[in-house]
Interface confidence: medium
Amino acid sequence: RKIPKVGHTFFQKPESCPPVPGGSMKLDIGIINENQRVSMSRNIESRSTSPWNYTVTWDPNRYPSEVVQAQCRNLGCINAQGKEDISMNSVPIQQETLVVRRKHQGCSVSFQLEKVLVTVGCTCVTPVIHHVQ
Amino acid sequence: GITIPRNPGCPNSEDKNFPRTVMVNLNIHNRNTNTNPKRSSDYYNRSTSPWNLHRNEDPERYPSVIWEAKCRHLGCINADGNVDYHMNSVPIQQEILVLRREPPHCPNSFRLEKILVSVGCTCVTPIVHHVA
């Protein structure tokens, strides 16, 4: 899928748009809101009934190079007694983000946008039970 | 910027960092992943900390539609189907990168933007602060 053109009538292409070669787009990777911080509740990954761990993946040819992935610690959920209850399921919650991939072909370098699926954390769900006829 | 290993066989191999501005192919790799969380799973309804999904639309952004989660309850759903306030539903937030049209309305010129989205909710033990 290509990036959609802006279709609304009031979004006429302004005169000030930079010239871009066909089939490509200009991308400024100086990130807007670079310094904003997630103000998530304290260590919810440990306090959750479906706790998770974090792993940092590193790829020097990706921007950003670091992507943090969560993995659920258990198949079941943690009950009030602190024990794993396998009648419930810990499942990953995922979110798409964009990254820029650098590709080397010989000595030339090209850049490609890529959608990456990030596991953000886990939640505890009631399982779907499939009854056998 | 990001440092990359040099290829000694190439001339002018000092570009260890990503340049500030790059020309990118319009086609997006892995573009076919499902962007509607309602269609991809029903965890939002089956979770002990269920959430509603709200559509956030902005034509100046790619992707133009982002789904935001909002926890349905302050507590969590217990085995009886009631909301139990000994536990708390909290949002799981994530910073993601999107494209912002820059200058505005331009069809093929973008800047990366970091935004904070609530992806879903999880059930946690509360931190209780008692007053002395």
Partner: antibody
Framework: QVQLKESGPALVAPSQSLSFTCTIS????????VHWVRQPPGKGLEWLVV???????TYNSALKSRLSISKDNSKSQVFLKMNSLQTDDTAMYYC????????????WGQGTSVTVSS | DVVMTQTPLSLPVSLGDQASISCRSS???????????LHWYLQRPGQSPKLLIY???NRFSGVPDRFSGSGSGTDFTLKISRVEAEDLGLYFC?????????FGAGTKLELN
């Protein structure tokens, strides 16, 4: 506009049970929760129970054994049943809409007065 | 249960005065999600309660800007900058962070 209206018997004998109905308009029960709150004459407010938009419930544990709440989304009605009434259950009973899961009662009914007396 | 303590229980005022009502909770009202579910209601004589302020400081729609809420943790205040006749009645604070939802005993705003 948003409206809630309570109905129920005005006089009940001790040890009897009591049923209230809250009829709503201007919003959907599949989108909002509804609380019940009571106020004894000349006193403060006491929260009883809430039924959330998804049908889940939360009771005041002190009264849970005597209360039962349900709803009919299609009829825009919420029902509250209270058992084993005593004289100290004499109060004005209100239903109120929850302001999107934040335990904020943004719109209230006018209340229905109940006297428990033999 | 979380105990909500309102002071004063009675507040005599003259029209045009500033009025201030305090509400203190027996434990912090900061929820795990970061929000503080402390709300203020006004019950005029012979009427049902009306929402004034939700989540500490947010005025509900149609509430005049002479009403303001502030505070954090366990200590909260409702201020009326210039009391008008329609402001007289019983003011309740309420918390929704911990079940069961609880109310303060009320503060009666009345004319001197």
């Amino acid at each position: 506009q948003v409206q809630l209206k309570e109905s129920g018997p005005a006089l009940v004998a001790p040890s009897q049970s009591l049923s209230f109905t809250c009829t709503i308009s201007g919003f959907s029960l599949s989108s909002y929760g509804v609380h019940w709150v009571r106020q004894p004459p000349g006193k403060g407010l006491e929260w009883l129970v809430v039924i959330w938009s998804d049908g889940t419930t939360t009771y005041n544990s002190a009264l849970k054994s005597r209360l039962s709440i349900s709803k009919d989304n299609s009829k825009s009605q919420v029902f509250l049943k209270m058992n084993s009434l005593q004289t100290d259950d004499t109060a004005m009973y209100y239903c109120a809409r929850d302001g999107y899961y934040i335990y904020t009662m943004d719109y209230w009914g006018q209340g229905t007065s109940v006297t428990v007396s033999s | 249960d979380v105990v909500m303590t309102q002071t004063p229980l009675s507040l005599p005022v003259s029209l045009g005065d500033q009025a201030s009502i305090s509400c203190r909770s027996s434990q912090s009202l900061v929820h795990s999600n970061g929000n503080t579910y402390l709300h203020w209601y006004l019950q005029r004589p012979g009427q049902s309660p009306k929402l004034l302020i939700y989540k500490v400081s947010n005025r509900f729609s149609g509430v005049p800007d002479r009403f303001s809420g502030s505070g954090s943790g366990t200590d909260f205040t409702l201020k009326i900058s210039r009391v008008e006749a329609e402001d007289l009645g019983l003011y309740f604070c309420s918390q929704g962070t911990h079940a069961p939802l609880t109310f303060g005993a009320g503060t009666k705003l009345e004319l001197n």
